[in-house]
């Protein structure tokens, strides 16, 4: 039997887009959707959008949440509509994370 290598899913999904990176758009199309929460100068910043580059989404979505940032990812049309990212509760320890840039 030939060893069939799995192929990465290249399907594009429609995602809710909310936040500064969205401009005037309320949706975007990408390989994954996300909902994120970060703390910027003491303020909670919520964003929703999409990753057009598969590897960017894959890396960002595997990053564990930290006290300053959390991101939840999904695949499916409008799948991030009812997702709100949550920061980890106090008392739990999480490894550090890096910021991600959004296009």
């Amino acid at each position: 039997v030939e060893d069939e290598k799995p192929k990465v899913n290249q399907k594009l999904y429609m995602c809710v887009c909310e936040g500064l990176s969205c401009g005037n758009e309320d949706h975007c199309e990408g390989q994954q959707c996300f909902s994120s929460l970060s703390i910027n100068d003491g303020f909670h910043v919520y964003q929703k959008g999409c990753f057009q580059v598969y590897e960017q989404g894959k890396m960002t979505c595997k990053t564990p949440p930290s006290p300053g940032q959390a991101v939840e990812c999904c695949q499916g049309d409008w799948c991030n509509r009812n997702i709100t990212a949550q920061l980890p509760t106090k008392g739990k320890s999480f490894p550090g994370t890096q910021n991600f840039h959004l296009e």
Epitope: P6, V8, Q52, V53, E55, K58, Q98, H101, E103
Partner: antibody, heavy 119, light 107 residues
Framework: EVQLQQSGAELVRPGASVRLSCTAS????????MHWVKQRPEQGLEWIGW????????KYAPNFQDKATITAVTSSNTAYLQLSSLTSEDSAIYYC????????????WGQGTSVTVSS | DIQMTQSPASQSASLGESVTFTCLAS??????LAWYQQKPGKSPQLLIY???SLADGVPSRFSGSGSGTKFSFKISSLQAEDFASYYC?????????FGGGTKLEIK
């Protein structure tokens, strides 16, 4: 300090297979995508593919789909590249590199492994 | 596949001069572009990511610009250690592709 240590040079016969290794230190490969790149003498760079060591997912350039197999063993923090049905066209230096959310690009590279295919 | 056309293929310059290389993508890639330096017998080293951002530890005489399909890479005030080969790479769509490289030689 981040380092990628690759296995030594290989001299192999046409038609044979070879497996190259890339052992990481200073970071956990589960937190990155591990890539392989080919460079033939006096030529440019060709991207072969990547593996996500956390879940085993792989992605290959079409030209290498039937030539290369990328694997990883997280317990030893090592990524592997297996090349099959070798011909003289496969004689090259092969580099491993990591891709993280620091830069969303390949920020650290191994020193390269020379593969020579000759009878 | 996205084709990356890099020019010039080679260039001669003197110490202290400035040089600029260009990379053209066959389709728009946003700012998903990196520039690498490679010296003979060595592995590539990341200089620029996201088209314009300088990687940690890279001297400020290196800079990148552009977005979409046209990108530039500049070295101002060339130092002896800058004579090497330089490659652009798009990371927008797999297969990730490299430009053909520019070999920078001392005049």
């Amino acid at each position: 300090e981040v380092q990628l240590q690759q296995s030594g040079a290989e001299l192999v016969r046409p038609g044979a297979s070879v497996r190259l290794s890339c052992t990481a230190s200073g970071f956990n490969i589960k937190d990155s995508l591990m890539h392989w790149v080919k460079q033939r003498p006096e030529q440019g760079l060709e991207w072969i593919g990547w593996i996500d060591p956390e879940d085993g997912e792989t992605k290959y350039a079409p030209n290498f789909q039937d030539k290369a197999t990328i694997t990883a063993v997280t317990s030893s923090n090592t990524a592997y590249l297996q090349l099959s049905s070798l011909t003289s066209e496969d004689s090259a230096i092969y580099y491993c590199a990591r891709y993280t959310s620091d830069y969303y690009t390949m920020d650290y590279w191994g020193q390269g492994t020379s593969v020579t295919v000759s009878s | 596949d996205i084709q990356m056309t890099q020019s010039p293929a080679s260039q001669s310059a003197s110490l202290g001069e400035s040089v600029t290389f260009t990379c053209l993508a066959s389709q728009t890639i946003g700012t998903w572009l990196a520039w690498y330096q490679q010296k003979p017998g060595k592995s590539p080293q990341l200089l620029i990511y996201a088209a314009t951002s300088l990687a940690d530890g890279v001297p400020s005489r290196f800079s990148g610009s552009g977005s979409g399909t046209k990108f530039s890479f500049k070295i101002s005030s060339l130092q002896a250690e800058d004579f090497a080969s330089y490659y652009c790479q798009q990371l927008y769509s797999t297969p990730w592709t490299f430009g053909g490289g520019t070999k920078l030689e001392i005049k």
